[in-house]
């Protein structure tokens, strides 16, 4: 995880995300994913 | 959900080797994506590595990545975790875990089920 701090003073946290393709469909390995601020965004 | 009863830790020397097990009760085992996550004293339960449901694919964290190898047998109802090239870093407790279909497989909450826990320690 990582924190960001703005000249605002607002923190931004960032988490990395991990998903499985196999989840979703017959695909293998992982899928990564970049969630801010409670929003998945990648 | 899934019971959970982790096993195989103990005390081991830098370098040396473990080999973790999980035994699962329930006839749902193989709808699970299953997980190893551990905590330190002190410090939050962090993810280590996780397996699908059919044992197709494995994620890893960075730190474990090439020492640590995730396994599972669906006929058993187990995973294992063999850990090989041990840290004095790696000393934590070890957790076995289920998650959902479609859970992030890399963060604790994400996670139904949990056994309660096996201590590894690695010291000289």
């Known amino acids: 995880d990582a924190e960001f701090r703005h000249d605002s003073g607002y923190e931004v946290h960032h988490q990395k995300l991990v998903f499985f393709a196999e989840d979703v469909g017959s695909n293998k390995g992982a899928i990564i994913g970049l969630m801010v601020g409670g929003v998945v965004i990648a | 959900e899934v019971q959970l009863v982790e096993s195989g830790g103990g005390l081991v020397q830098p370098g040396g080797s473990l080999r973790l097990s999980c035994a699962a009760s329930g006839r749902t085992f193989s709808i699970y994506n299953m997980g190893w996550f551990r905590q330190a004293p002190g410090k939050e339960r962090e993810f280590v590595a996780t397996?699908?449901?059919?044992?197709?694919?494995?994620y890893y964290a960075d730190s474990v990545k090439g020492r640590f190898t995730i396994s599972r047998d669906n006929a058993k109802n187990a995973v294992y975790m063999q850990m090989n090239s041990l840290k004095p870093e790696d000393t934590a407790v070890y957790y076995c875990?289920?998650?959902?279909?479609?859970?992030?497989?890399?963060?604790?909450?994400?996670?139904?089920?949990w056994g309660q826990g096996t201590q590894v320690t690695v010291s000289s």
């Open positions: 875990a289920a998650a959902r279909i479609g859970a992030a497989v890399n963060i604790p909450s994400e996670y139904d089920s």
């Open positions: 397996i699908t449901r059919s044992g197709g694919s494995t």
